[in-house]
């Protein structure tokens, strides 16, 4: 199962997907594309990095964060219905078969009338990041939950202590912060 | 490896439309990054021009705007540069460079020299 | 539009000396800055990209810091290669070059 992330028609939606470089500068090749992650690369390229930069992308998909220091979360502006789907995010971890995969189901809803802020999902992990959206409306202020730091071998030991609570599935499908190196 | 190269006539006549066009080896322009003209008058310092991306998209220098026009031939993976109205002022070794979506630049032509007179 | 002011234009030095160039831009641009080497009648090759991380193959002794209007390349001992003529630019998100230094033999 994917985890779901909500944004209204018109404002700006963020998926968020995180890992840490080795070194700083030291970048890990990162595609996200549209549709689930496939067995290599991704479908329907949206944006994708190499060891520098962003060399391909697509208009009104960003990068916001600072990528350089791991954080590849997709921004997407100006959102329609059809922004709806299921998306992937693939950490290229150089090696056979070393990729980490997170698949991010982003569920579009119509604008509401007359808009209030409300937050956009309840997560339970310490830190949270804290994202306004721009839009056609009001600013709205979302809180994502931000993971731990943790190492490729830990990720199953944990997702097992945690399997009763709500953190579990986000730690499985897309919040674990990927340690590289 | 990525190789670009200017190609175009050294000598333009005033008012008339200066062309220029940068073929690429060792990597497709439609695969990825953004493809910029930059030209240096002589003795002077460089100034961006303007790019075309991998999907066909173009930013241009806002001093350049009205007179620029940066277009692609992908089935001789071939970008060219169009300058309108030229004066002597335009006169300058033109590169062509391939860089990210943040326009900075990683491959250089190796330049073309350029000069407007009549 | 951002400017990129320069400094010094150009300046003399002898091999082995610590050599400091800066930059200031008109504006807060981020580290959304990169430096060129140029050798005349060629073309600019890249040294530094976002402030501070080198480009690849590029010596050591090459550094960039750096973030928001001041900017700085730092050769810490200077070779004879290294005589040349450096750019800074900003991208943010149109390109603009600062004015070049020029690194010449005391």
């Known amino acids: 199962s994917e985890v779901e992330y909500r944004a209204e028609v018109g404002q700006n939606a963020y998926l968020p997907c995180f890992y840490t470089p080795a070194a700083p500068g030291n970048l890990v090749p990162v595609c996200w594309g549209k549709g689930a992650c496939p067995v290599f690369e991704c479908g329907n390229v949206v944006l994708r990095t190499d060891e520098r930069d962003v060399n391909y992308w697509t208009s009104r998909y960003w990068l916001n964060g600072d990528f350089r220091k791991g954080d590849v979360s997709l921004t997407i502006e100006n959102v329609t219905l059809a922004d709806s789907g299921i998306y992937c995010c693939r950490i290229q971890i150089p090696g056979i078969m070393n990729d980490e995969k997170f698949n991010l189901k982003l569920v579009i809803k119509p604008a509401k009338v007359t808009p209030a802020p409300t937050r956009q999902r309840d997560f339970t992990a310490a830190f949270p990041r804290m994202l306004t959206t721009r839009g056609h409306g009001p600013a709205e202020t979302q809180t994502l939950g931000s993971l731990p730091d943790i190492n490729l071998t830990q990720i199953s030991t944990l997702a097992n202590e945690l399997r009763d609570s709500r953190l579990a599935n986000d730690l499985r499908d897309s919040g674990a912060t990927i340690r590289i190196g | 490896q990525v190789q670009l190269q200017e190609s175009g006539p050294g000598l333009v006549k005033p008012s008339q439309t200066l062309s220029l066009t940068c073929t690429v080896s060792?990597?497709?322009?439609?695969?990825?990054?953004?493809w910029n003209w930059i030209r240096q008058p002589p003795g002077k310092g460089l100034e961006w021009m303007g790019y075309?991306?991998?999907?066909?998209?173009?930013s241009y220098n806002p001093s350049l705007k009205s007179r620029i026009t940066i277009s692609v031939d992908t089935s001789k993976n071939q970008f060219s540069l169009k300058l309108s109205s030229v004066t002597a002022a335009d006169t300058a070794v033109y590169y062509c460079?391939?860089?990210?979506?943040?326009?900075?630049?990683?491959?250089w032509g190796q330049g073309t020299t350029v000069t407007v007179s009549s | 539009d951002i400017q990129m002011t320069q400094s010094p234009s150009s300046l003399s030095a002898s091999v082995g000396d610590r050599v400091t160039i800066t930059c200031k831009a008109s504006?807060?641009?981020?580290?959304?800055v990169a430096w060129y080497q140029q050798k005349p009648g060629k073309a600019p090759k890249s040294l530094i990209y976002?402030?501070?991380y080198r480009y690849s193959g590029v010596p050591s002794r090459f550094s960039g810091s750096g973030s928001g209007t001041d900017f700085t390349l730092t050769i810490s001992s200077l070779q004879p290669e290294d005589f040349a003529t450096y750019y800074c630019?900003?991208?943010?998100?149109?390109?603009?070059f600062g004015g070049g230094t020029k690194v010449e033999i005391k």
């Open positions: 630019s900003q991208y943010n998100p149109y390109n603009t």
């Open positions: 460079a391939r860089g990210y979506r943040s326009p900075w630049f990683a491959y």
């Open positions: 075309i991306s991998h999907s066909g998209s173009t």
């Open positions: 060792g990597y497709s322009i439609t695969s990825g990054f953004a």
């Open positions: 976002s402030a501070s």
């Open positions: 504006q807060n641009v981020g580290a959304n």
